[in-house]
Amino acid sequence: MLSHTGPSRFALFLLCSMETLLSSHMAPTHQLPPSDVRKIILELQPLSRGLLEDYQKKETGVPESNRTLLLCLTSDSQPPRLNSSAILPYFRAIRPLSDKNIIDKIIEQLDKLKFQHEPETEISVPADTFECKSFILTILQQFSACLESVFKSLNSGPQ
């Protein structure tokens, strides 16, 4: 079934940061300014929205799971930031069962926000077909809501 990781483990993730450069000019990925984070969120929003809408059309009548909680925001920063390391394992897990092309684009964007060398939790998808569909829907819904929340915080004045 699902393997969850508590907030304390995620807090530990946030302490792990390396000075690896993506390129000679680029700041380390965990050191992007709010302006660049906002650019990445703007790229993620239509991908996430499109993926969710397509899935809802394809899988009508599937309810949201109450057993899945995407810990998508960091608790240690103001405004809240997207907790890429917590989200990535879910998208890697649902990739074979959803639109691989769009999921790959989402993963590519999330990788840019990820702290360097953070361990990722293992996420296992429910074996039951109906539960699996419910799990995927929940991830997509929570991720869209999460992006909306972060985008609003980045737009609400001084960082």
């Epitope: 390129s23 680029m26 700041a27 380390p28 302006s35 790229e43 001084p158």
Partner: antibody
Framework: EVQLQESGPSLVKPSQTLSLTCSVT????????WNWIRKFPGNKLEYMGY???????DYNPSLKSRISITRDTSKNQYYLQLNSVTTEDTATYYC????????????WGQGTSVTVSS | DIVLTQSPASLAVSPGQRATISCRAS??????????IHWYQQKPGQSPKLLIY???NLESGIPARFSGSGSRTDFTLTINPVETDDVATYYC?????????FGGGTKLEIK
């Protein structure tokens, strides 16, 4: 080498639409972020907005109701449209590339001077 | 919006001397030890040219006479020694927060 070249009319009448083209060589507009900046006669620089590698746009809130940035990937060009111009929009308009997160605008066009006058 | 205040508005320096230009931000432009302030040089009739990125990193092809320093809200561009070819207006720019903003510019003249 990356080169950007602005083109468009040098004179626009008040209330009309200012339309400019930025032609890019040496890089593809399907990577990076492609910006418009203007410099007013008093030397003040203003950031106007961008179109991204995927076609996403974002604008300076001070211009949001009047500005549109579009692109044609087949021509490797991107465009600026500024509606309802006034004499306050008289400026030199530059296009520039923002290639990497956490970096700066490293390549600029030479600029094109636009006067708004009747 | 973050306001960048440059000083002085203009300065005249003799060749071989040091020129110092200040840029003050209305709020911090730092994230995890990186300062998102960049410096450009604009010569008459030309487009802006990137000199320094992230406060202190020299852009490729720019002479080491140019250097940048500072953090949080206070930044400095130093040209040492100044050459006659350095006559230009110098601008700071922040990419920390949207919308990106520029300083008012500092015009450098040679005595």
């Amino acid at each position: 080498e990356v080169q950007l070249q602005e083109s468009g009319p040098s004179l626009v009448k008040p209330s009309q639409t200012l339309s400019l083209t930025c032609s890019v060589t040496g890089d593809s507009i399907t990577s990076g972020y492609w910006n418009w900046i203007r410099k007013f006669p008093g030397n003040k620089l203003e950031y106007m907005g961008y179109i991204s590698y995927s076609g996403i746009t974002d604008y300076n809130p001070s211009l949001k109701s009047r500005i549109s940035i579009t692109r044609d990937t087949s021509k490797n060009q991107y465009y600026l449209q500024l509606n309802s111009v006034t004499t306050e929009d008289t400026a030199t308009y530059y296009c520039a590339r923002y290639g990497n997160y956490g970096y700066a605008m490293d390549y600029w066009g030479q600029g094109t001077s636009v006067t708004v006058s009747s | 919006d973050i306001v960048l205040t440059q000083s002085p508005a203009s300065l005249a320096v003799s060749p071989g001397q040091r020129a110092t230009i200040s840029c003050r931000a209305s709020e911090s432009v730092d994230t995890y030890g990186n300062s998102f302030i960049h410096w450009y040089q604009q010569k008459p009739g030309q487009s802006p040219k990137l000199l320094i990125y992230r406060a202190s990193n020299l852009e490729s092809g720019i002479p080491a006479r140019f250097s940048g320093s500072g953090s949080r809200t206070d930044f400095t561009l130093t040209i040492n020694p100044v050459e006659t070819d350095d006559v230009a207006t110098y601008y700071c720019q922040q990419s920390y927060e949207d919308p990106w903003t520029f300083g008012g510019g500092t015009k450098l003249e040679i005595k």
